[in-house]
Interface confidence: low
């Protein structure tokens, strides 16, 4: 009996995703079945299906499939998110480049190479031909898009629209055209499903025809998403499992993008004096390991075989024998001359934070005087006199020109958050440096001498909209969305600005993200009056260790009744011990009664000596961190959502005092939750919202 | 669930070394605090070291410069590497791992059988 192909690979999936169709005229075909690989089987061969299958759904709870003519980039049609479903769309239909000769091109470009506008292939005016839908099932004649149903050499074509030219090849790029990857693609997160000897790829979240480690829950970081090729584990480039069962892997043919810039997420801080993290930026020109043993040159296969080679690892820059770290090893190494010793660890490069000297700055950073001119994101500062008049629009008082030279890494402005400098990019006009405090220094950030306590409220009355004190509505709280689901918490604190964590945002593309706000139910039933969608332009990320993102929305908020910034608490600030608090949350446990309404659990602030002893001595609470607890001991959780607000209230005036994040627990019985301290953040909130340009409404 | 399984145990002569692994099946990225607890006959449990998600690090006066604690979240796994051992660091180990929910207030604590560490001449 011939073994049936496994045609899922030929998907890409969006888990957690399902369709709806908002246009009634669409058709859906529903059946019982036990795998998605039984619908993918079924969708592929438009087997009983009374239309061309596009994408289908499978329903794990019901075991069922629903198959669908279209997919989410069709008119009429919406996504949804589903905890039981998962949507699989052919991405022969998503498409936007071509395998081969482009046989199985699908997508929608309608427009000949040289720019003529195709003519239908259901129609024979202005040119006869034989190229009928009918006459051509499975080749998807549809509209006018370009196909090439016969496989010939040309690619995709059309009869064009122009009589005088009957037919045309369209410009479609080839996918191996399209796809680039910087360096060894270790970032590469492309649509290459692929080898380079033309092999389909193997579903990372399959383990037939080849078992492997490699499952997407193990490694959320290594985008093993359907089929695609990936790096994962430091090889030369990107490879992936293939369906040959007689072939376990194979690379797959992407090539280096011209333009060879990483991502500057993905650059590794260039060093040459000493070690940061650890050491895949280091390119300094130490060439033994620890011992003294002279390294072997990287072009060199004597003494020892290896494929470390600078042809294999082009960013890393392996020049000569220098000490390198090209494969995410513990600190840089090298293969050694010795034949008896294949590699070693050239140990006795220092470490950047255990340098002496200006490799890191005391206190506040203000009398830093090193040479380093980067921004933590890579950036390279701009000249200080070129933005004194930015400058002066922030801070009060003469800055120390003596102390402003160059394009350094300065603080000027008394920021607590240490040394920083302005960029030139209009996106980011300023950003802090990478460079950490002195080990052992304890010197506080927040000096406070004038006031030793200073309230957090503002000496301002609570302010009233439409004779509704704005405290007794929680029109701040807003919903994050990601790819059309809740995912977390946030405070509006500007009309344009949300803060919330750092955690929140698993994806870089911001068109996955939405901010909804007015409302009270967290799927927005019931609150379509009150609700503004806004799409998110720009995150900030905060100082290093904050885990507070600033989220700049694509334009303002439009404040009334439903919708209302929330305060910041005085920078420095101390909320005296007991005071009571609230944090917020739509809490969404995933349970099928969940009410899906805003929930509220009060607190009390704790004292962070008091609160590490309730955390068993595991945490030792800073500065930057704010405790509160259950008001009775025993009362359960607080139901918020990562990024949600610990909202206390002073003088009459409520105020975002902490943000939740990830990994500190709240409101356990005994186990206060820890929260971000807004108030040691707030001068950088207020930098950012006078600094960032946002859209005027 | 997340079980912990502690090895490395035994016996060692006082300024000997030991390393103690805890494997945790199931994935410890969505751990946040794991960590090392002992207890000695008729004594209290206490915490040796603890390490969070970030890297960040937490020890017991009495092994500060003897023991390091690190985590492999590839291989799921935290390490005590105890250098220097004395009579009085004869206890149970046990490892423990702290899993917080999906939202703030939901948090397991998990605990591993112990593993026997003997310093004596």
């Known amino acids: 009996q011939r073994k049936r192909r496994n045609t899922i690979h030929e998907f890409k999936k969006s888990a957690k995703t399902t369709l709806i169709k908002i246009d009634p005229a669409l058709k859906i075909k529903t059946k019982k079945v036990n795998t998605a690989d039984q619908c993918a089987n079924r969708c592929t061969r438009n087997k009983g299906l009374p239309f061309t299958c596009k994408a289908f759904v499978f329903d794990k709870a019901r075991k069922q499939c629903l198959w669908f003519p279209f997919n989410s980039m069709s008119s009429g049609v919406k996504k949804e998110f589903g905890h039981e479903f998962d949507l699989y769309e052919n991405k022969d239909y998503i498409r936007n480049c071509i395998i081969g000769k482009g046989r199985s091109y699908k997508g929608t470009v309608s427009i000949t190479k040289s720019g003529i506008k195709c003519q239908p292939w259901s129609s024979m005016i202005p040119h006869e031909h034989s190229f009928l839908p009918s006459s051509y099932r499975g080749k998807d004649l549809q509209e006018n898009y370009c196909r090439n149903p016969r496989g010939e050499e040309g690619g995709p074509w059309c009869f064009t629209s122009n009589p005088e030219v009957r037919y045309e090849v369209c410009d479609i790029p080839q996918c191996s055209e399209v796809e680039c990857m910087t360096c060894n693609g270790e970032s590469y997160r492309g649509l290459m499903d692929h080898t380079e000897s033309g092999k389909i790829c193997q579903r990372w979240d399959h383990q037939t025809p080849h078992r492997h480690k490699f499952l997407p829950e193990r490694y959320p970081d290594k985008g093993f998403d359907d089929n695609y090729c990936r790096n994962p584990d430091g090889q030369p480039r990107p490879w992936c499992y293939t369906l040959d069962p007689h072939t376990r892997w194979e690379y797959c043919a992407i090539k280096t993008c011209a333009d060879n810039t990483m991502n500057d997420t993905d650059v590794p801080l260039e060093t040459t004096e000493c070690i940061q993290g650890q050491g895949e930026g280091y390119r300094g020109t130490v060439n033994t390991i620890w011992n003294g043993i002279p390294c072997q040159r990287w072009d060199s296969q004597y003494p020892h075989e290896h494929d470390m080679t600078p042809e294999n690892f082009k960013c890393k820059d392996l020049r000569e024998n220098y000490c390198r770290n090209p494969d995410g090893s513990e600190s840089p190494w090298c293969f050694t001359t010795d034949p008896n010793i294949r590699v070693g660890y050239c140990s006795q490069i220092p470490n950047c934070d255990m340098s002496h000297g200006q490799d890191c700055y005391r206190g506040n950073g203000k009398n830093y005087m090193g040479n380093l001119s980067q921004t933590r994101s890579g950036l390279t500062c701009s000249m200080w006199d070129k933005n004194m008049e930015d400058l002066h629009r922030h801070i009060f008082w003469e800055p120390d020109a003596s102390k402003l030279n160059e394009n350094y890494c300065r603080n000027p402005d008394d920021d607590a958050h240490g040394p920083w400098c302005y960029t030139g990019n209009p996106l980011i006009p300023w950003d802090y440096c990478p460079i950490s405090r002195c080990e052992g220094d304890t010197t506080p950030t927040i000096v406070n001498l004038d006031h030793p306590v200073i309230s957090c409220a503002k000496t301002k009355q609570l302010r009233v909209v439409n004779g509704i004190p704005t405290r007794t509505n929680i029109g701040w709280m807003v919903s994050l969305r990601y790819r059309n689901k809740h995912i977390c918490g946030g405070s509006l604190i500007k009309e344009s600005w949300v803060l919330t964590a750092r955690q929140c945002f698993p994806s870089r593309d911001l068109k996955d993200y939405e901010a909804w706000l007015g409302i009270h139910d967290v799927h927005g039933r019931g609150d379509e009056k009150c609700k503004q969608v806004l799409n998110v332009s720009q995150l900030v990320y905060g100082p290093e260790g904050s885990d507070l993102v600033l989220m700049k929305l694509a334009r303002p908020a439009v404040l009334d009744d439903f919708v209302s910034t929330i305060d910041l608490p005085n920078y420095g600030c101390t909320i005296p011990e007991k005071t009571s608090c609230s944090v917020y949350g739509w809490g969404y446990t995933g349970l099928i009664n969940y009410d899906g309404l805003l929930r509220v659990a009060h607190l009390y602030i704790m004292g962070n000596e008091k609160c590490s002893q309730h955390h068993r001595g595991k945490v030792t609470l800073n500065e930057s961190e704010i405790c509160a607890g259950a008001e009775k001991i025993g009362s359960g959780p607080c139901e918020g959502d990562y990024g949600g607000p610990l909202v206390c209230e002073q003088h009459k005036m409520r105020m975002v005092l902490g943000v939740i994040v990830p990994g500190r627990g709240c409101a356990i019985p005994n186990r206060p939750g820890i929260f971000v301290r807004v108030a040691y953040y707030a001068k950088w909130i207020h930098k950012i919202i006078l600094t960032y340009k946002v859209p005027q409404s | 669930e997340v079980q912990l399984v502690e090895s490395g145990g035994g016996l060692v002569q006082p300024g000997g070394s030991l390393r103690l692994s805890c494997a945790a099946s199931g994935s410890i990225l969505g751990i946040n605090a794991m960590g090392w607890y002992r207890q000695a006959p008729g004594k209290q449990r206490e915490l040796v070291a603890v390490?969070?998600?970030?890297?960040?690090?937490n020890y017991a006066d009495s092994v500060k410069g003897r023991f390091t604690i690190s985590r492999d979240n590839a291989k799921n796994t935290v390490y005590l590497q105890m250098n220097s051992l004395k009579p009085e660091d004869t206890a149970v180990y046990y490892c423990?791992?702290?899993?917080?929910?999906?939202?703030?207030?939901?948090?397991?604590?998990?605990w591993g059988q112990g593993t026997q560490v003997t310093v004596s001449s």
């Open positions: 390490i969070n998600s970030g890297g960040s690090t």
């Open positions: 423990n791992a702290d899993e917080w929910g999906d939202y703030p207030g939901q948090v397991y604590d998990y």
